[in-house]
Interface confidence: low
């Protein structure tokens, strides 16, 4: 007769961890004429047939179920064992659920941290930006988001067995052109005959693309670069600027700077 | 088996309602993200709206937001789509299928709604 | 909303050979390409999901590739179970997954 009541076998003490290396034997209870070998599925280069061990080293997350054989003339199979195998969470990364198109300066905007599977599956969520903690729930939202948050974040998920974190994603952020200011270099008091250099500083992404420049009167001067340089400068010019910076998001405007052009010697000394 | 069983579809008249449920089976719902698409009849595939695995996260196409709600109930093994004043376009068979935030491994046999006066 | 477009709308192949199918998106997005068969009265069945990744149980003959904006589904040696529809669907861009219109895959 074929053996009688085999059974699979977990030799480890559970749970099993992915790394692990697992030992089955495959047990009967009676057998005539007696076991000559085994066999398993699925099969492996682990196997020892004469035996009835199998050793799987390194044993991998998704082993789901393993049988085995006792064979004499004929095979018996035991029913098949589940390894349960544990692992930390698996393909963690960041994913941006809202806006769909880029981001612009006061969007809402949220971040999903999404993992393909866990086992167990009572996972904790972790969110960082430059190394800092920011939250601890699945999702990660802005309700008003402004060009302080661009950067890194990584989210990581934990179970009992590990943690696994996400790429970096970089958050870019798109905003208007702010904080413009006109620097005037050598000074803002400037002799005339010498030459004055006005430059539209600004902080936009993405950068500014065109720039106008204005005088006193709010009149636009002939002018689009960031830089208004004046050579000779003469009296004239003295007064106030101030200059417009646009990017495909939209524009902004810097406060009045007002430049001095005093009289050289020769001209006071020709008065 | 790993199975999506569908029912609930129908006739219903322009601004009705109608509720589509999706049993799940032969495998740990709570694992996975679940969606609804739709396919008129002689047309192609349209995603209607999908939902993270443990009803957190969701979303819609712009065809049916505001006016359909997909939600889940883990304990019953189940996905709901509440649909609200349907219209004649709304007319599709609906299937449920496994993956809210993947492809679509598994799905439904689908249900007929039909909206018509 | 990224759209996508498959061509052609029909593909005439004769058992044996090879179909090639084509999808482009609008706009690039990460790797989030799957595509499906679909038979008259059935639902849509996965075959590739991840670009080129088949779907359990989906034989060998069935292979996709592509990045960026261009992917392509190849069908070698042709077989009489593969007449069907294809859509190709992209599913990085949560929540807004979308669905090519469909190649449809007949007998020459």
């Known amino acids: 007769y074929p053996p009688k009541k085999v059974t699979t076998v977990i030799q480890n003490p559970m749970p099993i961890r992915e790394g692990d290396t697992v030992t089955l034997s495959c047990n009967y209870n009676s057998s005539n004429p007696s076991v000559t070998r085994y066999e398993w599925k699925p099969h492996g280069a682990w196997e020892e047939p004469s035996l009835g061990v199998l050793k799987i080293q390194n044993v991998g997350w998704d082993n789901t179920t393993i049988a085995c054989a006792a064979c004499n003339s004929w095979c018996s199979w035991a029913s098949p064992v589940a390894l349960n195998v544990q692992y930390a969470p698996r393909d963690v990364r960041v994913r941006k659920i809202k806006p769909l198109s880029e981001i612009h300066s006061g969007n809402s905007v949220s971040l999903q941290c999404d993992f393909s599977s866990s086992h167990p599956k009572e996972v904790q969520f972790f969110w960082e930006k430059n190394g800092r903690l920011l939250g601890k729930e699945s999702q990660l939202n802005f309700d008003s988001i402004s060009p302080e948050d661009a950067g890194s974040y990584s989210c990581w998920v934990n179970n009992s067995i590990g943690q696994t974190a996400s790429k970096a994603w970089t958050l870019e952020v798109l905003y208007a052109p702010r904080r413009l200011r006109v620097s005037m270099s050598p000074g803002d008091q400037v002799m005339e005959g010498k030459s004055a250099t006005l430059t539209c500083e600004s902080d936009a992404n993405p950068p500014v693309s065109h720039y106008t420049w204005f005088d006193w009167n709010n009149q636009s001067l002939p002018y689009h670069s960031q830089k208004l340089r004046l050579e000779p400068v003469k009296v004239q010019h003295s007064g106030a600027y101030w200059c417009q910076g646009t990017n495909s998001v939209g524009k902004g405007r810097s406060p009045l700077s007002t430049l001095t052009v005093y009289y050289s010697p020769e001209t006071i000394g020709r008065r | 088996e790993v199975q999506l069983v569908q029912s609930g579809g129908g006739v219903v008249r322009p601004g009705g309602s109608l509720r589509l449920p999706c049993a799940a089976s032969?495998?740990?719902?709570?694992?996975?993200?679940m969606s609804w698409v739709r396919q008129a009849p002689g047309k192609g595939l349209e995603w209607v709206s999908g939902i993270n695995w443990n009803g957190g996260s969701t979303g819609y196409a712009d065809s049916v937001k505001g006016r359909f709600t997909i939600s889940r109930d883990n304990a019953k093994n189940s996905l709901y789509l509440q649909m609200n004043s349907l219209r004649a376009e709304d007319t599709a068979l609906y299937h449920c299928?496994?993956?809210?935030?993947?492809?679509?491994?598994?799905w439904g046999q689908g249900t007929m709604v039909t909206v018509s006066s | 909303r990224i759209v996508m477009t498959q061509s052609p709308g029909t593909l005439s192949v004769s058992p044996g050979e090879t179909a090639t199918l084509s999808c482009r998106a609008s706009q690039s997005f990460s790797n989030m390409l799957a595509w499906y068969q679909q038979k008259s009265g059935q639902p849509p069945r996965l075959l590739i999901y991840g670009v080129s990744t088949r779907a359990a149980g989906v034989p060998a003959r069935f292979s996709g590739s592509g990045s960026g904006t261009e992917f392509t589904l190849t069908i070698s040696n042709l077989q009489s179970e593969d007449f069907a529809v294809y859509y190709c669907?992209?599913?990085?861009?949560?929540?807004?997954?979308?669905f090519g219109q469909g190649t449809k895959v007949e007998r020459k």
């Open positions: 032969g495998f740990t719902f709570d694992d996975y993200g």
């Open positions: 669907q992209q599913y990085g861009d949560w929540p807004r997954y979308t």
């Open positions: 299928a496994r993956g809210g935030d993947d492809a679509f491994d598994i």
